[in-house]
């Protein structure tokens, strides 16, 4: 099948101890071989500080999955979630102010 | 992207060294960490810090009561400055841009050497 | 901090050879491993990164593979123009930390 980029959404949730899990989630791709990973001032966060869901098939011949880490509150502007598929990459951030969640289809 | 590290090649004991990286072809504000990095004689290098593309700095937990990187956006430069230097300061600093992994780009390096 | 172990220090080969150099680390890094090239008059180039990308103009003669603690740069054939020090990076656990070293000369 011919590629499908994906749409990525990054959400947050609600303040714990002065932190908030911070969720990039990338949905409707293809290939099913991604890139995902959450980023601070640019650098890929350590491998044990995120959590990755399966690459798991949508129902619609695309596939689906995602990454979360923990951050503290007030620092979310150093964070971006980045993405690579088939050639192509993207960043995403961490919406700002009372905004919970944004996404982009990357074409 | 190029990078180029400049300053003092002497510095006394007790002194700070402070040195500037001019960044040329992308903007230290567009993203990514900017790095200073030093190679002490017989190659060993350390890692010293970075400032990010959003002004946050990070720190070698050795140097951080040392060391303080900030920029000059207008001029698309950073600096380092590392105060009470020793002898053991003497190296070779390099300024490097740190992309998601790795550090893509570094400078040519600027020989440091700390003595009376 | 997170100690990696360069292995040999220095070797001489023919050009042509086979090179294979070794990094291990005192911990997991989780494929957060690098490899750089300093030429002797001290110019650093990035070669490979995440364990085994090749950054964009570097020769293909250049590969790298590993997982866990032990990492290792391989070049394929080698030629004139890769006598250098190679130093391997961790980036998984800050502080991010380096090898010591390893200075490829021909025979």
């Known amino acids: 099948g011919s590629t499908v980029p994906p749409m990525v959404n990054v959400t947050c949730s609600e303040v714990s101890e002065g932190n908030i899990t911070v969720t990039c989630r990338a949905s409707s791709f293809y290939p099913r071989n991604i890139t995902l990973t959450w980023r601070q001032d640019g650098v890929s966060l350590s491998h044990n500080t995120q959590q990755w869901g399966d690459v798991l098939p949508d129902g619609n011949g695309t596939y689906q999955t995602w990454v979360a880490t923990r951050i503290r509150q007030g620092e979310e502007q150093r964070f971006t979630c980045y993405m690579e598929h088939s050639g192509n990459h993207g960043t995403h951030p961490v919406p700002s102010g009372n905004s919970h969640h944004h996404h982009h289809h990357h074409h | 992207v190029q990078l180029q590290e400049s300053g003092p090649g002497l510095v006394k004991p007790s002194q700070s060294l402070s040195l500037t990286c001019n960044v040329t072809?992308?903007?230290?504000?567009?993203?990514?960490?900017w790095n200073w990095i030093r190679q002490f004689p017989g190659n060993k290098l350390e890692w010293i810090g970075y400032?990010?593309?959003?002004?946050?700095?990070t720190y070698n937990p050795s140097l951080k009561s040392r060391v303080s990187i900030t920029r000059d956006t207008s001029k698309n430069q950073f600096f380092l400055q590392l105060n009470s230097v020793t002898p053991e300061d003497t190296a070779t600093y390099y300024c490097?841009?740190?992309?998601?992994?790795?550090?893509?780009?570094w400078g040519l390096g600027t020989s440091v050497t700390v003595s009376s | 901090d997170i100690q990696m172990t360069q292995t040999p220090s220095s070797l001489s080969a023919s050009l042509g050879d086979r090179v294979t150099i070794s990094c291990r680390a005192n911990q997991d890094i989780s494929h957060y491993l690098n490899w750089y090239q300093q030429k002797p008059d001290g110019a650093v180039k990035l070669l490979i990164y995440y364990t085994s990308r090749i950054h964009s103009g570097v020769p293909s003669r250049f590969s790298g593979s590993g997982s866990g603690t032990d990492y290792s740069l391989t070049i394929a054939n080698l030629e004139q123009e890769d006598v250098a020090t190679y130093f391997c990076?961790?980036?998984?656990?800050?502080?991010?930390?380096f090898g010591g070293g390893t200075k490829v000369e021909i025979k």
């Open positions: 400032i990010g593309y959003t002004g946050s700095t």
């Open positions: 490097a841009r740190w992309r998601n992994w790795a550090m893509d780009y």
């Open positions: 072809g992308y903007s230290i504000t567009g993203d990514y960490a």
């Open positions: 990076q961790q980036g998984n656990t800050p502080p991010t930390t």
